[in-house]
Each structure stands twice: as C-alpha cells, then as structure tokens.
C-alpha cells in the first residue's frame, strides 16, 4: 500500500480468482483513543471499533472511502483504490491502446518544434468518475524539471457503438535549449483513476523523435505564362524553431486529382517553392519535415489548382 | 527515404555537401546495424545514449547560432567563457568564432574515426562476420575532415590485447552510431547555418 496523495492510498493486488488479497491497517488521524467506529462509503454499518481497523482487501467491494467517527462526528477519511496486477503485468483497463506507432501505445506525444514544449494525448471509452494527473521529467535517476498543465477533455468521437473520449495535456521543459543534443529521454507519467481503480501509464521519448511540424503556411500559386505549369510557394510555419537556416525543413509537394485513384505527382525540395503542372480539378498540397532528422511529416497544406 | 539530391552551387560553403553526405552515410549505417543486429538491443529506446566527445569537445555550444545565444538554457553549460562576452556575441560570425566551431567539429570527427576504426578491427575478427563498418561512411568522415582542413596531432588507433567480446562490441557499435548520427545532424545544421550566413 502506498499514498497517492493526502488520505488516498493505493493497494496493489495480485489479481486472480480466489487470491488472498492484502491485509491493510488503517489508522484514524485523531488524538482520540476511545469510542472510535469505522464505516465504508455511505453505509452506516459499523465495520469495527478502535483507533486502527484491519481489513483484508481482495476485491473492489473492499475498496472505497473508510471513515472513522466518534459520537456522530467525522474524524478522518482514508480512500482506498485498487491497482490490479494481472499475471505480473499492471492492468490497462482505463485507456485504449492506440496501436500507433506500435502495440501497447497508450500515450502519444508530439512537439511542433525544439522549444521543449510538447503535447500528449490518450483515449478512453469511459465518460464519468474519471480523473487524470500528469507528471513529467527529463531523465529518471536525476530528473530535470518539466512542467505539465492539467489534462483536459480535448475531443469526443463516435466509434461504432461506443463513444471515445480524447484527453490531452501540454508540458514544457523548464530549461530547454532548442539546439541541445538530447541524451536523456523525457519521461511522462499519467495516473488514471476510474471509480476505485488506479492505473498508471508511462511514455519515454526524445523531443527529436516526436517532432511534427505544423503545415507550411501561405501556400500560393502563381501561373507561369504560356504554360500549364504553376509556381507553388509557401513559408515555414510560425511555430517552427528559428533560425530556419539552422532548423531547416524539407518539403514534399503533391499534385492530386479529384479522384483518389488518380496518380499522384510528388516532388521533394528543400526550397520554399516548386514548379509543377496543375491539372484541371486537381489540388496542390505541401507538407514539411525536419530536413536532417526524419521524424513525422506535417499535415498537408492544400490549395485548389483552379 | 530516397529524395532527389540537390547538387551544391560552386560558390556554396564547401563543407555543406560533405556534411550532407556524412549524415546520409551514418543514417544508412545505423539502419543496416539495426536490421543486422535485430536480436541485440540496438534501437534508440534500448541503448544507453553515451557521447564519447563529452567534456572533450563542445560543438553544440561553440556552434550555437547567434539567435540562440540569448537563450539562457543554451548558455548555462558553456565552458567557453568568451562566448558570453558581449562583444563576441555581437560579432558571432567572426572568423575566430567560426574557426572555433569548425575545429570542434573536426575534433569530433577525429574521435569518432578512431573509435570506428578500432571497432572495425574487432568486428573483422568475429567468426560470425555479422557486421562491419561501411567503408563509405569512413571515407565520408575522412573527406569532411580534409575539407575542414585543420591540422592536429594524429590520435593513435587503440589496440587491445585481450580477446574481444563480440556481443559487447556490437552493442557499443549501436551506441556509437546513434550518438554519431545525432552529432551528424548538429554538424549538418551548423553547415547549413554557416552557408546561409
């Protein structure tokens, strides 16, 4: 058993049918010695008396808010949560496996640049009685500071019969140098509590590996005289690290017909312009990627050919 | 990814082309190592990230773009005290500063070259003959060093008398390649920045 926060405790259980569970001793936070009784949740049934209460915690029915009273007055509370260990592996019931970039990916994180700011998000089908708390650091043995905000519900989607909820959090490394070469990964830890179930999820990454630039901005077409060709131009996104001559991007320019089946023409360039043939009803799209470290491509910025 | 490679302009900062070749070569070598050594811990998540140049060179600091010298977090680990001197900050692109940056890059390349050659000698003794260093990568390191045109004492190749532990050598190769790729990215950024200046 360990303390998650004041008056909230997590009981770790080896989870299998007929498991013996864990013996837990609760102590009433009071100078009083006599006339103390214990109850669980809203029930008025007295579970025991005395300054300490010994319970065998086996199932969720044994978890909850234990309260010690004296003469109708509440003295203190202890909330017991359960953390299930199933065959040596901590349960992952609360969050959905996003399966990207690999199986057992519960937390996904992205950064728009090298400033040390990043966003993480996760999915769940649970809509109520759910709380999250996020901590982060650079390295784990001698951790350096990363400050995270509160996790917020950022999207709701319908998937088949189920509703899916997306939560996200923004974090900022306290003293980040964009040019630094990372040798210690960022660690992100999410505590999730659903009703009386506790779970924790972690992700470890280097900022360089989660970079996904914003799409190029100011995408424009300039028709070339007496030609089907057009000059496409764009700019670096505002959110990208500066100076751009140091933090350079490379670009992919795509000409896509109205039909998804039509052949796509693609050109790669390090410049912020390209000359392409503009077909009728086609659209031109441009996306960006770090020129020197191949992390994710940005989403496409698009303009119609007409 | 195989992208069309732009040929450098004749007037272009001469090292840029070599640094781009270096990054391409080390990235290819790392990819080959990860595939060949699939049963060894060779991915970024599995290895310890060690920097053999730590406390010996200060490339990131010496080559910091002028625009980032205002960032406290980029300055706090600098041993090169003159960088923080106001007059030097103002003339960041002076030949003195550039020389310091390029000599630091040269020292990095020299250290990695020695390590890679020593390692290759060990790998050639492996009866499994599982993996060797790409000669192209070693040649590209050499070309960039020549283009940088610094003279410094030659570091003797480390020779080891004891029987090599091939498992450890292959893991060390992975560690070295990961670190060198990161340094090659920094070198490429620096060359691009200097070329634009």
């Amino acid at each position: 058993i360990w303390e998650l926060k004041k008056d909230v405790y997590v009981v770790e259980l080896d989870w299998y049918p007929d498991a013996p569970g864990e013996m837990v001793v609760l102590t009433c936070d009071t100078p009083e010695e006599d006339g103390i009784t214990w109850t669980l949740d809203q029930s008025s049934e007295v579970l025991g008396s005395g300054k300490t209460l010994t319970i065998q915690v086996k199932e969720f029915g044994d978890a909850g808010q234990y309260t010690c009273h004296k003469g109708g007055e509440v003295l203190s509370h202890s909330l017991l949560l359960l953390h299930k260990k199933e065959d040596g592996i901590w349960s992952t019931d609360i969050l959905k496996d996003q399966k990207e970039p690999k199986n057992k990916t519960f937390l996904r994180c992205e950064a728009k640049n090298y400033s040390g700011r990043f966003t993480c998000w996760w999915l769940t089908t649970i809509s109520t009685d759910l709380t999250f708390s996020v901590k982060s650091s650079r390295g784990s043995s001698d951790p350096q500071g990363v400050t995270c905000g509160a996790a917020t519900l950022s999207a709701e989607r319908v998937r088949g019969d189920n509703k899916e909820y997306e939560y996200s959090v923004e974090c900022q490394e306290d003293s980040a140098c964009p040019a630094a070469e990372e040798s210690l990964p960022i660690e992100v830890m999410v505590d999730a509590v659903h009703k009386l179930k506790y779970e924790n999820y972690t992700s470890s990454f280097f900022i360089r590996d989660i970079i996904k630039p914003d799409p190029p901005k100011n995408l424009q077409l300039k028709p070339l005289k007496n030609s089907r060709q057009v000059e496409v131009s764009w700019e670096y996104p505002d959110t990208w690290s500066t100076p751009h001559s140091y933090f350079s991007l490379t670009f992919c320019v795509q000409v896509q017909g109205k039909s998804k089946r039509e052949k796509k023409d693609r050109v790669f360039t390090d410049k912020t312009s390209a000359t392409v043939i503009c077909r009728k009803n086609a659209s031109i799209s441009v996306r960006a990627q770090d020129r020197y470290y191949s992390s994710s491509w940005s989403e496409w910025a698009s303009v119609p050919c007409s | 990814r195989n992208l069309p490679v732009a040929t450098p302009d004749p007037g272009m900062f001469p090292c840029l082309h070599h640094s781009q070749n270096l990054l391409r070569a080390v990235s290819n070598m790392l990819q080959k190592a990860r595939q060949t050594l699939e049963f060894y811990p060779c991915t970024s998540e599995e290895i310890d990230h060690e920097d053999i140049t730590k406390d010996k060179t200060s490339t990131v600091e010496a080559c910091l773009p002028l625009e980032l010298t205002k960032n406290e977090s980029c300055l706090n680990s600098r041993e090169t005290s003159f960088i923080t001197n106001g007059s030097c900050l103002a003339s960041r692109k002076t030949s003195f500063m550039m020389a310091l940056c390029l000599s630091s890059i040269y020292e990095d390349l020299k250290m990695y070259q020695v390590e890679f050659k020593t390692m290759n000698a060990k790998l050639l003794m492996d009866p499994k003959r599982q993996i060797f260093l790409d000669q192209n990568m070693l040649a590209v390191i050499d070309e960039l060093m020549q283009a940088l045109n610094f003279n410094s004492e030659t570091v003797p190749q480390k020779s080891s008398l004891e029987e090599p532990d091939f498992y450890k050598t292959k893991i060390k190769l992975c560690i070295l390649l990961h670190a060198f790729r990161i340094r090659a990215v920094t070198i490429d950024r620096v060359m691009s920045y200097l070329n634009a200046s």
Partner: antibody, heavy 115, light 112 residues
C-alpha cells in the same frame, strides 16, 4: 472453490459451426479476464482467444481471427467460444482458463472436425 | 509458430536433477514473467511455477524456476516417477499481450 465446467464439444463437418461454453463458479466471474487455449492431438498448447473482464476487448490468434468469436455473459457466469467455418486443423481439445498469476483450467472439451 | 523453444525431451533416473530450458527473446521472456505447467496424459495443464520462480502452494519444492535474460529454466531436483509428463513454459510478448505464448513442450521421461 473455483470451478470451470466446459460443454459443447463434439464432431462437426468442415465449414460448419460449433459453440463451446465454460460455466464458472466459486469466484466473481465478472472481475476476471478469460482465455481459450487448445491442444491438437499429440501436439502442444496453443492460445486461441482472450476476453477482458467486462467484454470490452477481445484478442484472437491469427489462426482463428475472423472465424472464432469469444464472448461472455457475466449475468450467467459463462464464457463462450463461437466457432465458424471449421477446418480439420481446428481439431483439438479446447480449454477455458482464468487470467492471472494463479490460473484455473476447465476440464477440456474435444472438438473433432471431420467429413 | 512457437517463439519459445524447449528441448523435445529430457530424461533422468529417479533422484537425479533434470532441467528444462525455455529460450525466447527480448520482447517476451526478456520483458515478461515466465510460468511453467505440467500436463499429465489426458488432463488439463497444472501450474507449477509463476512469476519466473514462485511456487503455488501444493507444488512440491523439488520444482524450481529461474530466468536469466531471454531464457528461463525449470529444474526438478530428485525427479520421481510421477513427474513423467509434458512440461510447457509460458510467457507474453510486449506487443501482443494478453496473448499467451507457449513453449514447444518437453516430454520428461523417468528411466528405470
């Protein structure tokens, strides 16, 4: 004590269907994940499928994906394996089993796919 | 396709020490716990070892398990005639959990 009693096995022709049941008692069935494991005659153990305690997630071996469906009725304390498009290579003793460090197995039920 | 490899058979005379190996990889045994089962002819498997080296109550202490790196082993010290059976190791893979990964199985024969 924990008990898992299996039923539903038998002889079936290739291409036909069969449903296996596993009745649980002696524990809170709705709190635990469940597996199906099979063993072809003279062969080793092969995992078939898993279902979460609440039925929200199901996992299958590639060899049965799209043909077999694992399900559970927590109100009846029963686990099921619906097998469709049966093949000769599905011939095996099928076991249900609880998920956890200490597990309990059903007695097994024989499924023979033969024309 | 079994990812956990066991020797097809091992044998020993009563009182001898018999060991069965189970070889895997970094993503299975290297990252997860190992279990061992005993299966007597015509019966369901019986758990002998969980959590690499833990014995459930009721399992004789002549059975012991261990794990090192990407391999595990089961030892029977002082093998007895009633130990003649098939033995299976089981683990999980990091990427496919909760799918059970079983070993190829080992037939233990007690001679004499």
């Amino acid at each position: 004590q924990v008990q898992l009693v299996q039923s539903g096995g038998g002889v079936v022709q290739p291409g036909r269907s069969l449903r296996l049941s596993c009745a649980a008692s002696g524990f809170t069935f709705s709190s635990y994940g469940m597996h199906w494991v099979r063993q072809a005659p003279g062969k080793g153990l092969e995992w078939v499928a898993f279902i979460r305690y609440d039925g929200s997630n199901k996992y299958y071996a590639d060899s049965v994906k799209g043909r077999f469906t694992i399900s559970r009725d927590n109100s009846k304390n029963t686990l099921y394996l619906q097998m469709k498009s049966l093949r000769a290579e599905d011939t095996a003793v099928y076991y249900c089993k609880t998920h956890g460090s200490h597990d309990n197995w059903g007695q097994g039920t024989m499924v023979t796919v033969s024309s | 396709s079994y990812v956990l490899t066991q020797p097809p058979s091992v044998s020993g005379t009563p009182g001898q020490r018999v060991t069965i190996s189970c070889s895997g990889g970094r993503s299975n045994i290297g990252s997860n716990c190992v279990k061992w089962y005993q299966q007597l002819p015509g019966t369901a498997p019986k758990l002998l070892i969980y959590g690499n080296d833990q014995r459930p109550s009721g399992v004789p202490d002549r059975f012991s398990g261990s794990k090192s790196g990407t391999s595990a082993s089961l030892a029977i010290t002082g093998v007895q005639a009633e130990d003649e059976a098939d033995y299976y190791c089981q683990s999980y893979d990091r990427g496919t959990h909760p799918a059970l990964l079983f070993g190829t199985g080992t037939k233990v024969t007690v001679l004499g």
